[in-house]
Interface confidence: low
């Protein structure tokens, strides 16, 4: 049975050119997190961090997104592109999937400085 | 264009050991993961395991792990695959696959490598 | 692990049959699923991934659709050309599975 929850950063917005956390967590339960899956709206992956191989980002993102913290991923120098729903999803032993959802915002920098309160700490 | 080139067919006894290349061209060859993939005669396809060309970490399939070693060689842009204590059942045509750029999918082949096993 | 399954085994269509393959994983794979398309003597070539999206370069008569565990390919003209064995392949994490093929044969 699935006892465990996904807590998320929810909605975020961030600087065009700037960098911005997703952040993940995974609680209530003490299922083994084998892997974690980043994927972007239109489901291609950005990276995977695998408990025993470690991260892995692949190739049409390496020069923009940064591993971590934790099992999180650091996207950088953001573009009007980048905007939309971002997924974590951890594969757990025994429990099996739990799916996360972030919703990304990128705005001009004008825009930007008034929504500081939606950038992670 | 990218380009994956291995080598020529070989044929070996039961107990010995193959070491298959594959060259790799028109790309940066440390970017991305080098798989192989091996498809016995009349059958589908079986992943064996992966390198990453720019840390040389390796990930194997369980059911060759104790028999597979991959390596690189970044000069020459090469990837290796050497199957050890070979039976008849290792018969088969090796690939090298390039991975995809949002997953590990193969969008790129090698040409395949026959190895026979054979007394 | 996760295993693929394919659907029929083998078909026998005519030129200009539409032409449905189907791929049943073991458990939830969300979209994480890639088709190939591979002819006697030559490598697999890469039709789809990410479960819908067209490689570079693959007609437009091709198309995958579905998620989770049930997914489909389907050619909507089938063309001498598309003869061949098809397989499909779960792409996130390890191992990476292939199912058994679907062998496409002239009826």
């Known amino acids: 049975m699935m006892t465990g929850t996904i807590e998320t950063t929810g909605n975020i917005s961030a600087k065009k050119g700037g960098s911005v956390i997703l952040q993940c967590h995974l609680s209530s339960t003490m299922a083994q997190v084998t892997q974690v899956n980043w994927e972007q709206h239109d489901h291609s992956l950005l990276a995977i961090r695998n408990a025993e191989l470690g991260w892995h980002i692949y190739p049409a993102f390496k020069d923009r997104v940064a591993p971590g913290p934790g099992l999180g991923l650091t996207l950088q120098s953001l573009t009007m592109n980048d905007t939309g729903e971002y997924f974590c999803t951890y594969h757990t032993y025994p429990d099996g999937t739990y799916r996360g959802r972030i919703f990304l915002e990128v705005l001009e920098s004008s825009v930007a400085e008034h929504s500081a309160r939606f950038q992670i700490p | 264009e990218v380009q994956l080139v291995q080598s020529g067919a070989e044929v070996k006894k039961p107990g010995a050991s193959v070491k298959v290349s594959c060259k790799a061209s028109?790309?940066?060859?440390?970017?991305?993961?080098m798989h192989w993939v091996r498809q016995a005669p009349g059958q589908g396809l079986e992943w064996m395991g992966r390198i990453d060309p720019d840390s040389t970490g390796s990930k194997y399939n369980e059911k060759f792990k104790t028999r597979v070693t991959m390596t690189r060689d970044t000069s020459t842009s090469t990837v290796y695959m050497e199957l050890s204590s070979l039976r008849s059942e290792d018969t088969a045509v090796y690939y090298c696959?390039?991975?995809?750029?949002?997953?590990?999918?193969?969008?790129?082949w090698g040409q395949g490598t026959l190895v026979t096993v054979s007394s | 692990d996760i295993q693929m399954t394919q659907s029929p085994s083998s078909l026998s269509a005519s030129v200009g049959d539409r032409v449905t393959i189907t791929c049943r994983a073991s458990?939830?794979?969300?979209?994480?699923l890639a088709w190939y398309q591979q002819k006697p003597g030559k490598s697999p070539k890469l039709l789809i991934y990410n479960a819908r999206t067209l490689a570079e370069g693959v007609p437009s008569r091709f198309s995958g659709s579905g998620s989770g565990t049930d997914f489909t390919l389907t050619i909507s003209s089938l063309q001498p050309e598309d003869f061949a064995t098809y397989y499909c392949q779960y792409h996130s994490g390890s191992p990476l599975p292939f199912g058994g093929g679907t062998k496409v044969e002239i009826k």
């Open positions: 028109g790309y940066t060859f440390t970017n991305y993961w």
């Open positions: 458990e939830n794979i969300y979209s994480y």
């Open positions: 696959a390039r991975e995809g750029a949002y997953g590990y999918y193969f969008d790129y």
